[in-house]
Interface confidence: medium
């Protein structure tokens, strides 16, 4: 028999109480770890890093800071104004040897457009990465650099769940041992070919992403090149077999009737925490019909809610969810119609997603106002439209090109959209900002491994 | 020019205790992280221990038996070193931030 492989990554999550704070309950909060989690784990799955196949994560243990938790001495994410630097070294600055990453998700409006930030891992000789165990580094300070953080905000606006999800990919990228994407066959979106640059540019990709291109969500040759040297040094250090659930990470997986936490997490009467004996521990007290942990549909006094209790809000593109009465779980809400618009007039729903361009509404396709191309860079922050397969017809919604449709009315991109061929965000104020891809892990790795740039720490 | 100058290694039976010195020459202006590192045979360089400030930091597997300490008026910063063990064996190496590195001295644990 074959000994079974190392290939799962096990996660240490914490949200801040930002975080907390916009998504509103421990309960939505835990759906989108989840959600990102299950994201990250259907990339890696289905990714062939030369030979090693079916890398997957699991979440060994969550920490959710409360607004409660705002206040907290020891709570280390307290702090309202601080640098993503600041935030990814915060991170660091715990033990996290149990874990093969350690990740903190926030609702931070970082600057210029920053997403996230994670340590890249290295075959030999690495600081930093997946792996990484906790040690002294030349600030004087332990840190653990098996580390990252991804945020939902930019710009003042929040990034769509498939942006999200694909930072989050990003980051754990970096971890694994990718660099940003280079080079003409790693970087297609950049291509003056059309055929290529339709398919947009890969998850290593350093500036901005949409999310709903062709390569968005598969790894490069070059990531796939630098990722497999890392992965065949490392994963026996810290990956685990796959299979058994984990009961007291907060996610209720095979094999679990609920999952609350541990015992100093819990606050779920319905459910046996962590703490309790093998045949109790993540099982439903007796009597108990359900466990909030399991979906939002359970009350605090573990039963079913009733048939017509919301359970989801309306969006743009899809409508309330209501409980059936006899799960726990939110039941998927119905689709609004097909080219309904939404995200403020500058999208249309496709299959009860806020996924397509208000371009298609009239049979045309988005495109880049780009100031390569010579337009002015006012425009570069507006919904462009062009005819389908010819960029030579790319024009402002608000051009007399398009008025027909849009009756000379501008429609300008939501703040932190990608603009300028993705090589930025729009800001608040319609500029396209130009994301800087490397500076922010550029001046940590400086303050951690050459502090003596960095005068007069403490005396 | 300001240089570090180590002292204090030696041979040692496992158990046995050692204190290293540091001291430095020339002012310097703007110190804030001393440290000493470890360099075993065929290994890297690694941090044991630092001081900055009034905080002390140990590598785990010194902790509890190392001590960090500096003398300002002396300038110099020790490292006392308690029940030493075969794999503490060394060159021992002070680092001043802004200071390039010393010779080192050389500490070796018997078993």
């Known amino acids: 028999t074959t000994s079974a492989e190392k290939n799962t990554c096990q996660l240490y999550i914490q949200t801040d109480h930002l975080f907390f704070k916009y998504y509103g309950t421990r309960e939505a909060v835990i759906a989108q770890i989840s959600s990102h989690v299950k994201a990250i784990d259907t990339i890696y799955q289905t990714t062939d890093f030369s030979g090693i196949r079916n890398i997957s994560f699991m979440v060994k243990r969550i920490r959710i800071n409360t607004t409660a938790d705002e206040k907290d001495p020891t709570n280390p994410f307290r702090f309202p104004n601080i640098g993503v630097e600041k935030f990814l070294e915060l991170n660091s600055e715990q033990n996290h040897d149990d874990y093969c990453l350690a990740y903190v998700f926030t609702d931070r409006d970082f600057d210029d457009g920053v997403l996230g930030l994670a340590w890249v891992g290295a075959p030999s000789g690495s600081s930093g990465g997946i792996c990484e165990k906790s040690k002294l580094y030349s600030d004087g300070k332990k840190k653990s650099l098996n580390t990252g953080i991804i945020t939902v905000q930019n710009y003042g606006s929040h990034v769509p769940p498939k942006v999200s999800h694909i930072t989050f990919a990003h980051e754990v990228g970096h971890n694994f041992g990718s660099p940003h994407d280079s080079g003409t066959e790693c970087t297609p979106g950049e291509s003056k070919n059309l055929g290529q640059k339709e398919n947009g540019n890969y998850i290593m990709y350093a500036r901005a992403t949409s999310g709903d291109k062709l390569n968005n969500n598969k790894f490069s040759l070059c990531s796939i090149r630098n990722i497999s040297q890392v992965l065949e040094k490392k994963r026996n250090n810290c990956f685990v077999e796959s299979g058994q659930p984990i009961c007291g990470n907060g996610m209720v997986e095979q094999g679990e009737e609920c999952d609350c936490g541990y015992s100093d997490q819990c606050k779920d009467e319905c459910c046996f925490d962590a703490n309790q004996p093998e045949g109790r521990k993540c099982k439903l007290k007796p009597g108990k019909q359900c466990s909030p942990s399991q979906g939002p549909c359970c009350t605090a006094q573990c039963a079913f809610k009733s048939k017509s209790e919301k359970c989801r809000d309306d969006s743009d593109c899809a409508r309330e969810g209501i409980c059936n009465g006899f799960t726990a779980l939110c039941p998927a809400s119905d689709p609004k119609p097909n080219f309904t618009d939404c995200n403020r007039h500058t999208q249309v729903c496709i299959n009860g997603q806020c996924a397509g361009s208000i371009c298609e509404k009239y049979g045309l396709e988005e495109c880049t106002c780009a100031s390569s191309d010579g337009k002015d860079d006012k425009e570069l922050c507006h919904v462009c439209c062009m005819k389908k397969m010819d960029p030579s017809t790319c024009a402002s919604t608000g051009s007399v090109q398009w008025s027909r449709h849009f009756s000379g009315r501008t429609i300008t991109l939501q703040p932190g959209s990608p603009c300028n061929d993705f090589r930025g965000y729009c800001d608040v104020f319609m500029r396209c900002r130009l994301v800087d891809a490397d500076g922010p892990l550029a001046r940590l790795k400086k303050a951690i491994f050459s502090p003596e740039l960095y005068e007069n720490i403490a005396e | 020019e300001v240089q570090l100058v180590e002292s204090g290694g030696g041979l040692v039976q496992a158990g046995g205790s050692l204190r290293l010195s540091c001291a430095r020459s020339?002012?310097?202006?703007?110190?804030?992280?001393m440290a000493w590192y470890r360099q075993a045979p065929g290994k890297t360089r690694d941090m044991v221990a630092a001081?900055?400030?009034?905080?002390?930091n140990y590598a785990d597997s010194v902790k509890g038996r190392f001590t960090i300490s500096r003398d300002n008026a002396k300038n110099t910063v020790y490292l006392h070193m308690n029940r030493l063990k075969p794999e503490d064996t060394g060159v021992y190496y002070c680092k001043i931030s802004g200071v390039d590195w010393g010779q080192g001295t050389q500490v070796t644990v018997s078993s």
């Open positions: 001081i900055i400030g009034d905080s002390t």
């Open positions: 020339g002012r310097i202006s703007n110190i804030n992280i």
